[in-house]
């Protein structure tokens, strides 16, 4: 490309720049020990320190640990990046009641709509389920298919939050009451799945790959490096990526040079206590004698609050013990008690949450 020659010549005459043939332009040469944040840096601000994997470069140019989503009730929402931490959120089926930097300090199960009520807004990772009274003439057992549809992809009924989050102006919050025996029996039937592969014991990124290379002649790769498991935060510090090494966690997104790893609970578990980019505590999906169904939507995206049921109705399901504790166990297919008479069991694949009705369908 003869027309590029003048540009190339001007680069050669300037020791602080080099010519990149790939992009056909002059690029700023990052000083020794710094690495570029883009393919062809144009100015000193395009160069950064590098951090170990799982660390990011923060605003003060320090490598800072990405948060870990290693708690049972958290999943990784965004990975550890060179300039930002991993972000954790409550795992599907739970919502955050106490937030923390880049994470959640406490997750609670989405509430189950009691008898006579249906889901208005499914729970998300940030909000509890919102329930509303079923349409007039609809029985608590959802006799009318039009008003109480069973979802095709579905969601599994979730335990009440403890405490229940404040209601919106259009819906009153109502805790689900009732015995805990069912949940305890169901939980006792859960069996642990074999550990699935996680990030334990292996580097989350190859320290020899491009972002961690020193700045070779004629290259723009001059960013600061971090050790594996650290990422470069916004201030240029190497920050620890969270760890998914607990038995009940799996890696959702890997530790990157500029963002933290994020973790989520293993299949069949949901996050009860979230942490930044991870989950502090995973518990098995609770099962409830559900006379309620939820409309098909991603449970991790919305959460559950109640509108008052019609007079005379009583919520009758509390899928987990009052203290919210449940054994940390999973299984690829869990045989779970569905009704309070213990007359039926229903295998529930953990790959996709399902909604249960009192008929066991």
């Amino acid at each position: 490309f003869p027309q590029d020659r003048p540009f190339e010549d001007t680069c050669h005459g300037n020791p602080s720049h080099y010519y990149d043939k790939a992009v056909r332009r002059c690029c700023y040469r990052c000083p020794m020990g710094l690495f570029p944040t883009q393919q062809c840096p144009q100015r000193p601000t395009d160069c950064r320190k590098q951090c170990e994997p799982d660390y990011y470069l923060d605003e003060a140019d320090r490598c800072t640990a990405c948060v870990t989503c290693s708690r049972d009730d958290l999943v990784e929402k965004t990975p550890c990046a060179w300039n930002s931490s991993r972000v954790c959120e409550c795992r599907p089926g739970m919502f955050c009641s106490t937030s923390a930097v880049n994470s959640c300090a406490r997750c609670f199960f989405h509430s189950v709509c009691p008898a006579g009520m249906i889901v208005k807004f499914p729970g998300t990772a940030q909000k509890n389920t919102v329930c509303e009274p079923a349409s007039p003439g609809v029985s608590p057992a959802c006799a009318s298919p039009e008003n109480c549809k069973e979802p095709s992809s579905g969601t599994i009924p979730q335990a009440k939050p403890t405490p229940v989050s404040p209601a919106t102006s259009s819906a009153s919050t109502m805790p689900v009451r009732g015995g805990t025996r069912l949940a305890q029996e169901a939980a006792s039937k859960l069996t642990r799945a074999p550990d699935s592969p996680s990030s334990v014991g292996r580097p989350s990124s190859d320290p020899g790959l491009s972002p961690t290379q020193p700045c070779p002649e004629g290259s723009g790769d001059c960013r600061k490096q971090c050790e594996p498991d650290y990422y470069l935060d916004e201030a240029g510090r190497c920050t620890a990526c969270v760890s998914c090494s607990r038995d009940d966690l799996v890696e959702k997104t890997p530790c990157a040079w500029n963002s933290s790893r994020t973790c989520e609970c293993r299949p069949g578990m949901i996050c009860a206590t979230s942490a930044t980019n991870s989950c502090a505590r995973c518990v098995p999906y609770p099962i409830c004698a559900a006379e309620t169904v939820t409309k098909p939507q991603d449970m991790a995206e919305k959460d559950t609050t109640f509108e008052a049921p019609p007079l005379g109705t009583q919520p009758d399901c509390n899928p987990t013990p009052e203290n919210g504790e449940a054994p940390a166990s999973t299984s690829p297919t869990q045989s779970l008690l569905v009704d309070s008479q213990a007359s039926k069991t229903l295998p529930i694949p953990t790959s996709a949450p399902v909604a249960l009705s009192s008929t066991g369908k």
Epitope: T64, R237, S243, T276
Partner: antibody
Framework: QVQLQQSGAELAKPGASVKMSCKAS????????MHWVKQRPGQDLEWIGY????????DYNQKFKDKATLTADKSSSTAYMQLSSLTSEDSAVYYC?????????????WGQGTLVTVSA | DIVMTQSHKFMSTSVGDRVSITCKAS??????VAWYQQKPGQSPKLLIY???TRHTGVPDRFTGSGSGTDYSLTISSVQAEDLAVYYC?????????FGSGTKLEIK
């Protein structure tokens, strides 16, 4: 298993330099970054800095930027630290250490330490 | 730099006792705290990281806890071999920093 074998004790005069080594075995040397830590007698531990043996990238604690120089030799799986312009303040045990990525954020593996004594 | 403060230089205990060693960070370190045990003439040994995760092979009598700026290492039932200096370290941000150490003495 992972082992870090450090070189023997050094006796040096003020103003001189010393270079100590840390030979790694039991893992792929270029996979883990090597950290160096200083411990003065009866005192706490201080992080000096680290090197990525795969790329020779180094980063230092500001306090040691003009004191320590970290290098690595991939062919012998050995990391080195050179201390320059020695004073009595540099008399200490120096450790090399590394993490175990994916399952440990602390320094899981340590060398046995190299004692440096600076004396006229 | 983040300063890690171990307020007790020495702690005296008896075999079988429960003891807690504390560490305070000068700023929130988001549970990125490790604990080490160093016996006389030996290198430090990693016990705990991420405030509460026990390192491989560490006896379960060692437990770490804490959040924000306050952290502790608890030995549920002290054994004679636990005589050592215990250091906390923040692995949250470079430069990584250590506490000044707490020497555990057996009565």
């Amino acid at each position: 298993q992972v082992q870090l074998q450090q070189s023997g004790a050094e006796l040096a005069k003020p103003g001189a330099s010393v270079k100590m080594s840390c030979k790694a075995s039991g893992y792929t040397f270029t996979s883990y970054w090597m950290h160096w830590v200083k411990q003065r007698p009866g005192q706490d531990l201080e992080w000096i800095g680290y090197i990525n043996p795969s790329t020779d990238y180094t980063d230092y604690n500001q306090k040691f930027k003009d004191k320590a120089t970290l290098t690595a030799d991939k062919s012998s799986s050995t990391a080195y630290m050179q201390l320059s312009s020695l004073t009595s303040e540099d008399s200490a045990v120096y450790y090399c250490a590394t993490r175990h990525y994916g399952s440990s954020y602390g320094f899981a593996y340590w060398g046995q330490g190299t004692l440096v004594t600076v004396s006229a | 730099d983040i300063v890690m403060t171990q307020s007790h230089k020495f702690m005296s205990t008896s075999v079988g006792d429960r003891v807690s060693i504390t560490c305070k960070a000068s700023q929130d370190v988001s549970t990125a705290v490790a604990w080490y045990q160093q016996k006389p003439g030996q290198s430090p040994k990693l016990l705990i990281y991420w405030a509460s995760t026990r390192h491989t092979g560490v006896p379960d009598r060692f437990t770490g806890s804490g959040s924000g700026t306050d952290y502790s290492l608890t030995i549920s039932s002290v054994q004679a071999e636990d005589l050592a200096v215990y250091y906390c370290q923040q692995h949250y941000r470079t430069p990584f920093t250590f506490g000044s150490g707490t020497k555990l003495e057996i009565k």
